[in-house]
């Protein structure tokens, strides 16, 4: 069938979920890209003790999530609902800060060193997190 | 040994339709993301389009956004590109190509031998 | 989008010469940059990957280096069938990785 019981070789397993740690920076459309390209998502944080998980493997390193108002409201990328949901950002934000001069404001959302969230230019190339449901991906795992 | 293996190319008027295959041998297909990517007669190498493992996500150049689809059939380890309203300029050989993750870093390491296809009237 | 420019178009160069390539990308790219090499006629084949990284089965007289928007591409000791075009390529722009327009290395 097309469900797995682990997760792929480098993921980790946690609560029905796998997530990717990168080691590297990207423009946060282009971390959305390739997690897409990995059947998965930038991670979508629903809960304290998933942010708690995020944020131990991730450290004190500036890390995209899957959340943007580039379009208006702010919306995380697999369709769970902002409003309701939960949130973890710093004191102030997000701000929309349009002082950094790059052009426009922030409109990505992003850990910071602390865990907490702030939104900031989405070009910015920051590490990222890809994640995916194990009801969601492939049986076989890859070759690498 | 693993292997890509491109077919359908040919000779196409303008305006016309063509559909390519990529069958795959001796690796997890399902596991992998595909590519199609294109060389025009003694041009350089440009990437055409990609689509995830499962088939879920699909991205395309802007030059044949609209005109080409890429699709996979994980039953049979093949790659299809459905390439319609054909023009002069896509005129090239045609490759598959294996998309390699290590570490966030992404590149095309395993490739096919390529079908041409030729758009002329 | 990123552009990928390559220098020289073209060299000749003996067996046995240490060869360079440099490769350049319009904006910071970190160390998404791969290296092909294409023979006439045939696909192209991944040499490097991640500016550095040799693929399996290359032989260990290529080398890569750089970081940002300046790359190089080293054969050490250019053998016979080395003589093919080299493609450097970004991987920063994910699915967009866009070509360099390649450098012909002839035989001298």
């Known amino acids: 069938g097309s469900e797995r019981t682990c997760c792929p070789v480098n993921w980790v397993e946690h609560e029905r979920s796998c997530y990717w740690f990168s080691r590297s920076g990207k423009a946060w459309a282009d971390a959305d890209n390739y997690c897409r390209l990995e059947d998965a998502h930038l991670v979508v944080v629903t809960s304290w003790e998933e942010q708690k998980f995020v944020q131990h493997h991730i450290g004190p390193v500036n890390t995209w999530m899957g959340l943007h108002d580039q379009n208006g409201p702010w919306k995380w990328v697999d369709g769970t609902d902002y409003e309701t949901g939960f949130k973890n950002w710093r004191p102030e934000q997000p701000d929309d800060w349009y002082g950094h001069g790059l052009g426009g404001g922030e409109d990505c959302a992003h850990f910071t060193d602390d865990g907490r969230w702030n939104d900031d230019v989405c070009q910015r190339p920051y590490r990222w997190v890809c994640e995916t449901e194990l009801d969601k991906a492939s049986q076989e795992p890859p070759l690498l | 040994e693993v292997q890509l293996l491109e077919s359908g190319g040919g000779l196409v008027q303008p305006g016309g339709s063509l559909r390519l295959s990529c069958a795959a041998s001796?690796?997890?297909?399902?596991?992998?993301?595909m590519n199609w990517v294109r060389q025009a007669p003694g041009k350089g190498l440009e990437w055409v389009s990609v689509?995830?493992?499962?088939?879920?996500?699909?991205f395309y150049a802007d030059s044949v956004k609209g005109r080409f689809t890429i699709s996979r059939d994980n039953s049979k380890n093949t790659l299809y590109l459905q390439m319609n309203s054909l023009r002069a300029e896509d005129t090239a050989v045609y490759y598959c190509a294996s998309r390699l993750a290590v570490a966030g870093s992404e590149a095309f390491d395993i490739w096919g031998q390529g079908t041409m296809v030729t758009v002329s009237s | 989008d990123i552009q990928m420019t390559q220098s020289p178009s073209s060299l000749s160069a003996s067996v046995g010469d240490r060869v360079t390539i440099t490769c350049r990308a319009s904006?910071?790219?970190?160390?998404?940059l791969n290296w092909y090499q294409q023979k006439p006629g045939k696909a192209p084949k991944l040499l490097i990957y991640a500016t550095s990284s040799l693929q399996n089965g290359v032989p260990s007289r290529f080398s890569g280096s750089g970081s940002g928007t300046d790359f190089t591409l080293t054969i050490s000791s250019l053998q016979p069938e080395d003589f093919a075009t080299y493609y450097c390529q970004q991987s920063y722009s994910t699915p967009l990785f866009t070509f360099g327009p390649g450098t012909k290395v002839d035989i001298n």
């Open positions: 689509i995830s493992g499962r088939g879920i996500n699909t």
């Open positions: 904006q910071s790219i970190n160390n998404y």
């Open positions: 001796e690796f997890t297909f399902s596991s992998y993301a």
